[in-house]
């Protein structure tokens, strides 16, 4: 069976029907359907006016405008808000009421596209394998990134979050139109990785998506990750304004000037250093979501009541921090270079700025405890990786899971750890699953490009597709049309259960209390340390253009360079065309399948590190499980990122006069705001009033936006406000 042309709100669209084998199965593929009008710089997306005739949806459209890996030119286009759909078809009747899975790509909110890197005409985010193996509809789409997607003045002049609103427009388009493609508009699952995983998380928390999302999967990124929320957007807006010659004294004039500046100039005005960094790489990621008082009405830690009815899977890779650690400390991947105590202490101190000397020392002591018994370079390098994995991914994900569980009504919660080792031949043998290593398996690359993979890789891919698509169908990864290798138990605050995903899975794959000692350290011990408010706690950023080095790889393999293997410290420069040959991915997640390691398995899967493979010691107390992390604004552990040393600004609530009007925007219904019950909902950050966070006010032109403290504008905001 095949769909032929489909009538959407924009008009008729015609895709391609691709036959699969001799049994009559096929997949209908639609590429490049507009879900919003061509964008205007630094403006919210608008509905597409539609078209006449039949749109031939047969080719991917250009990605949204972004810098090339060398950061000296741009590619992509301002007209970029398009989506792609894969619909599996049986032999006889066209599909009806299929679950829908919407992918949100990663790339540090700075780069990426809905189709991903291309290798042998197979795109990383090609939905065919998931769709046909799992019998689900797969949707991918583009959203604005970098300054064009996330530049904000921290007030109503430029509220920011344009890229998040693009994502919402795509989700809402799917809700309204997917029935015509054979999808069930009441069974939409979001899934995404890295910044895409965080975006999934943020979309579930935004009141604008009330009633749109049934389930969600966050891979290596949640709303609470320390690189997700920009607490000092004006600092970064001014940096760009200065570069393009806009006035910075008055926010309104600056905003008007930025809106009429050549979008390419805006894009190139922001450069991320990759080599010779003075501070950890994540300090330099400036254009990310903000708490705008509308789309994201309050600190994400206080919005989990909005996701109370959404089934949720979240997890990380066991060495998610490896690629970042290897940029921050290049010795990690070099057998002839050593990591010293001094190196690690410096790194730790840069991540713990807001807690001053005590924060650095206690953190250093906790992480180097094993060094006395095992002073080997391998152990020390693993420690650095574990540290960055914990801070950037694992701890925030654990907190997000606990928050979801604590607020959930009917919704289920599941946790996983992906440990199938990286296949990058240039990496040391001890490296586990690096950041973005999971993507290739979720998207079925071992089946789509089999020559680059081994049978064990296909086993992992089959299992992940089965779990992911079963979950999309039923809300339970064990139940659906696909057989799974072992039962995945839900996460609860009592058991902290998680599934370890490896090539050999059985009953022992279900584990408990991942790295509990470190989770408890960050959420209890570290949190209790006094915050240093001294201005010296915030590092000064490099200001020159000398650091115009490649963008750090953060999830979209198509733009991620191979980690350096020589002594130069600089990665090779890949091609820069929009559709040319992709750079070699750092993590085997895409394009060129990496050279298989010699031997049967390559590096063995690394057990959850830091606890010597032994089950972590449960915390003291009655429950035998880690406590649910503090939920008030003052108690968001490694979560709230990139603020000044002081507390984050709070959206105006209650004291600013009359309460805002409930939303009239795209939400579809009044937003859910956290309830006041501290047992299940985080304490709202509203000072003394005790009132819940402000709901969105509909039109972001007039949205309340939290004030930003600009008194330290000359300084670089710390990326983590631990």
């Amino acid at each position: 069976a095949k769909l032929g042309a489909v009538y959407t709100e924009g008009g008729f669209v015609e895709g391609v029907n691709k036959k699969l084998g001799l049994l009559g199965d096929s997949v209908d593929i639609f590429k490049g359907i507009p879900f919003a009008a061509p964008t205007k710089a630094l403006e919210n997306p608008q509905p597409h006016p539609g078209w006449q005739g039949t749109l031939k949806a047969k080719n991917f459209k250009k990605r949204c405008l972004q810098a090339t890996i060398t950061q000296d030119s741009t590619y992509g286009d301002e007209d970029c808000l398009y989506l792609n759909i894969w619909v599996p078809q049986g032999r006889k009747q066209v599909s009806r009421d299929l679950p829908v899975m919407i992918w949100i790509y990663g790339g540090a909110f700075l780069m990426g596209s809905g189709h991903g890197a291309n290798f042998l005409n197979n795109y990383l985010y090609d939905g065919e394998e998931i769709a046909t193996r799992g019998n689900v509809i797969v949707v991918t789409f583009n959203y604005r990134v970098g300054p064009l997607g996330f530049l904000s003045t921290g007030d109503a002049n430029l509220p920011g979050n344009y890229g998040l609103r693009d994502q919402h427009m795509a989700i809402a388009w799917v809700k309204r139109n997917i029935a015509a493609f054979g999808g069930d508009p009441n069974n939409i699952t979001l899934f995404g990785e890295s910044a895409g995983g965080a975006s999934v998380s943020l979309q579930t928390l935004s009141p604008y998506n009330k009633g749109l999302i049934r389930r969600a999967i966050s891979q290596s990124g949640v709303a609470l990750s320390p690189w997700v929320i920009q607490k000092n957007p004006l600092f970064w807006a001014k940096k760009v304004a200065e570069k393009v010659g806009c006035p910075v004294g008055d926010a309104a004039r600056m905003a008007q000037c930025l809106k009429v500046t050549d979008p390419r100039a805006l894009t190139l005005a922001y450069k991320v250093p990759l080599a010779g960094l003075e501070y950890p790489m994540l300090h330099y990621v400036g254009f990310v979501p903000v708490i705008d008082g509308d789309f994201i009405p309050a600190d994400p830690i206080n919005l989990y009541a909005n996701a109370a009815d959404i089934d949720y899977i979240a997890g990380t890779n066991n060495m998610d921090g490896h690629i970042f650690a290897s940029i921050d400390m290049p010795a990690i991947n070099k057998g002839n270079k050593k990591v010293t105590e001094e190196d690690f202490y410096k790194l730790v101190s840069e991540f713990t700025i807001t807690k001053g000397l005590r924060g650095a020392k206690t953190t250093f002591d906790v992480y180097t405890e094993s060094w006395a018994q095992d002073p080997s370079q391998e152990n020390k390098k693993k420690t650095v990786v574990d540290f960055e994995t914990d801070v950037l991914f694992l701890v925030p994900t654990e907190i997000a899971l606990a928050q979801h569980r604590a607020n959930a009504k009917s919704a289920k919660t599941y946790a996983y750890l992906f440990s199938h080792p990286s296949r990058m031949p240039v990496y040391p043998k001890w490296v586990g699953a690096d950041h973005a290593d999971d993507i290739q398996y979720v998207f079925g690359k071992p089946f789509a490009t089999p020559t680059g993979y081994r049978p064990q890789d296909r086993t992992v891919s089959k299992a992940m597709i089965a779990y992911w698509t079963n979950f999309a169908k039923t809300g339970d990864p064990n139940m659906g049309d696909s057989a799974v290798p072992t039962h995945w138990e839900p996460y609860t605050t009592e058991n902290s259960g998680y599934l370890e995903i490896t090539k050999k899975m059985g009953s022992s794959s279900m584990k408990r209390s991942l790295r509990t000692n470190f989770l408890r350290y960050w959420t209890l011990t570290y949190l209790a340390l006094p915050t240093v408010t001294d201005q010296e706690a915030t590092p000064v950023p490099p200001t020159g253009d000398s650091e115009a080095t490649p963008v750090p790889p953060t999830g979209d393999s198509e733009t991620a360079p191979v980690p350096p293997t020589g002594d130069s410290g600089a990665p090779p420069v890949p091609p820069t065309g929009d559709s040319g040959a992709p750079p070699v991915p750092p993590t085997g997640d895409s394009g060129a399948p990496p050279v298989p390691p010699t031997g049967d398995s390559g590096a063995p899967p690394v057990p959850p590190t830091g606890d010597s493979g032994a089950p972590p010691v449960p915390p003291t107390g009655d429950s035998g499980a880690p406590p649910v992390p503090p939920t008030g604004d003052s108690g968001a552990p490694p979560v709230p990122p990139t603020g000044d040393a002081g507390p984050p600004p709070v959206p105006p609530t209650g004291d600013s006069g009359a309460p805002p009007v409930p939303p009239t925007g795209d939400s579809g219904a009044p937003p859910v705001t956290p309830t006041g019950d501290s047992e299940t909902a985080p304490v709202p950050p509203t000072g003394d009033s005790g009132a819940p966070p402000v709901p969105p006010t509909g039109d972001s032109e007039a949205a309340p936006v939290p004030p930003t403290d600009d008194s330290k504008e000359a300084q670089m905001p710390a990326v983590i406000r631990f």
Epitope: E9, P49, A172
Partner: antibody
């Protein structure tokens, strides 16, 4: 100027079929989608489906799938709507309407055709 | 399908009055159109894309709203404005509101 002229009133028995025509003039016939909307006596408007006169692609609302067929004749710039297995509740005025621009507003309407289904 | 609910179902007003009709969608929609229909006549497009006026429509008609809540306003009623008004949403299966009958008081 844009004109949509529909065929005359029809009286049909239950179980029969009716075919209503809509002749377009004043614009390029194949460039705009044509919709069919019906209105039962004293009731509101109900969208039935749409045809692209350029390639003949159609889309029908779930309620009418299997009973309605929309076709076009480019040589005469005419679209047709055939409704089968008529029942008394199909008694209504049937309108053809052309897109105004883009894909949404129905900017130009025919005068309507009354179809009465009665035994 | 997306349900469209208009309010009020009917209303009486006098020439010169300012009149407001609302339309609420059961979920967020991208575009909303308004039509005017007089007895025995075909509907006429009044406003499209929530707030845009087709050529020939008097400026006393205006529309606003986004997401789920929309409004049609007639700033100063004229005798020829007494009619039934329908809202319509655009999706893969367009639907109309049940109509609002505007009568002379």
């Amino acid at each position: 100027q844009v004109q949509l002229v529909q065929s005359g009133a029809e009286v049909k028995k239950p179980g029969a079929s009716v075919k209503v025509s809509c002749k377009a003039s004043g614009y390029t016939f194949t460039s705009y989608n044509m919709h069919w909307v019906r209105q039962a006596p004293g009731q509101g408007l109900e969208w039935m489906g749409v045809i692209n006169p350029g390639d003949g692609y159609t889309s029908y609302t779930q309620k009418f799938k299997g009973r309605v067929t929309m076709t076009r004749d480019t040589s005469t710039s005419t679209v047709y709507m055939e409704l089968s297995s008529l029942r008394s509740e199909d008694t209504a005025v049937y309108y053809c309407a052309r897109d105004y621009y883009g894909s949404s507003p129905l900017g130009y309407w025919g005068q309507g055709t009354l179809v009465t289904v009665s035994s | 399908d997306i349900q469209m609910t208009q309010s009020p179902s009917s209303l009486s007003a006098s020439v010169g009055d300012r009149v407001t009709i609302t339309c609420r969608a059961s979920q967020s929609i991208s575009y909303l159109n308004w039509y005017q229909q007089k007895p025995g006549k075909a509907p006429k497009l009044l406003i499209y894309a929530a707030s845009k006026l087709p050529s020939g429509v008097p400026s006393r008609f205006s529309g606003s709203g986004s997401g789920t809540d929309f409004t049609l306003t007639i700033s100063s009623l004229q005798p020829e404005d007494f009619a039934t008004y329908y809202c319509q949403q655009r999706s893969s299966s367009p639907t109309f509101g049940q109509g609002t009958k505007l009568e002379i008081k």
